[in-house]
Interface confidence: low
């Protein structure tokens, strides 16, 4: 068990703070909830603290919760491939470029680390080149979320990881908006981290609303499990 992994044996409170600017539309989001890495479970509620969110909530899911991939469930035989927990408590910087097909792009930078007993994900997001009447600024996405695989590989040069995946957002007319994600994670501290073999995270996300919440918000339930690396040969013959 890595030193960082010991911090995730129980339920951990989570705080998410985002400052965003998409085509000049500025906004802030606060989120809070908890994560349980034993089950790969995240429960979070996000509130747009500046009024109405200028982009659809589903376009921010990867920035919020795929930001705290330290809550992914890594099976026993894969624990030596869990970069995310091994970087804690000092944490990691997570940078992404997200290309929305035939539309604009988000660039994000986040610091994910422990502050006391709370896991904090602080994000800055800049979006450019979006069409004002496109699927994103035109709010044409359905309020739901598909399952995805998130592919992880080591980046030995930077003592971190590279991550690639493609999100499929459902559009109200029945078509799909693709969002290509290019992600890099580097540790904040200079302690040892686990550099993984290639594998993937399998994600299931459910979006809902709080009937008592008047502000623009999103409630998120998510399960994330690591996969893609088989047991070693010695395991097969036990």
């Amino acid at each position: 068990m890595s030193k960082g992994e010991e911090l995730f044996t129980g339920v951990v409170p989570i705080l998410v703070e985002l400052d965003g600017d998409v085509n000049g539309h500025k906004f802030s989001v606060s989120g809070e909830g908890e994560g349980d890495a034993t089950y790969g479970k995240l429960t979070l509620k996000f509130i747009c603290t500046t009024g109405k969110l200028p982009v659809p909530w589903p376009t921010l899911v990867t920035t919020f919760s795929y930001g705290v991939q330290c809550f992914s469930r890594y099976p026993d035989h894969m624990k030596q491939h869990d970069f995310f927990k091994s970087a804690m408590p000092e944490g990691y910087v997570q940078e992404r470029t997200i290309f929305f097909k035939d539309d604009g792009n988000y660039k994000t930078r986040a610091e994910v680390k422990f502050e006391g007993d709370t896991l904090v994900n602080r994000i800055e997001l800049k979006g450019i080149d979006f069409k004002e009447d496109g699927n994103i600024l035109g709010h044409k996405l359905e309020y739901n979320y598909n399952s995805h695989n998130v592919y992880i590989m080591a980046d030995k040069q930077k003592n971190g990881i590279k991550v690639n995946f493609k999100i499929r957002h459902n559009i109200e007319d029945g078509s799909v908006q693709l969002a290509d994600h290019y992600q890099q994670n580097t540790p904040i501290g200079d302690g040892p981290v686990l550099l993984p073999d290639n594998h993937y995270l399998s994600t299931q996300s459910a979006l809902s609303k709080d009937p008592n919440e008047k502000r623009d918000h999103m409630v998120l339930l998510e399960f994330v499990t690591a996969a893609g690396i088989t047991h070693g040969m010695d395991e097969l013959y036990k």
């Epitope: 409170p13 989570i14 705080l15 703070e17 400052d19 802030s28 606060s30 989120g31 809070e32 603290t49 500046t50 610091e111 680390k113 502050e115 006391g116 007993d117 709370t118 904090v120 602080r122 800055e124």
Partner: nanobody
């Protein structure tokens, strides 16, 4: 702008307790963190305790750990500092401060805060 008004200061004997309150008004939705600082005569303004507005996670100066507790009531837009086992060296003017959103993690320096109250005097007699 965010306006901050402190209350609850006063004179107390060593070993006693006080509870300070800081009521925030204005654009409180833009607040990321709030903190308490104190300034004794002729000394720098020192960090005491801080709290994140959204999740309520807390952080403390070493001198406050185990004796002081910071908390918040979001519905009332108020932050509290419960001070127990007070010592004469705790005598100071106590200031409430608010920080706008930004990237500083667990802000503890005075220049990391954007809004300040007028302060409330705490005197601990021996």
């Amino acid at each position: 702008q965010v306006q901050l008004v402190e209350s609850g200061g006063g004179l107390v004997q060593a070993g006693g307790s006080l509870r300070l309150s800081c009521a925030a008004s204005g654009r409180t939705f833009s607040t990321a963190a709030m903190g308490w600082f104190r300034q004794a005569p002729g000394k720098e303004r020192d960090f005491v305790a801080g709290i994140y507005w959204a999740a309520g996670s807390t952080y403390y100066a070493d001198s406050a750990k185990g004796r002081f507790t910071i908390s918040r009531d979001n519905a009332k837009n108020t932050v509290y500092l419960q001070m127990d086992s007070l010592k004469p060296e705790d005598t100071a003017v106590y200031y409430c401060a608010a920080r706008r959103r930004g990237f500083t993690l667990a802000p503890t320096r005075a220049n990391e805060y954007d809004y300040w109250g007028q302060g409330t005097q705490v005197t601990v007699s021996s």
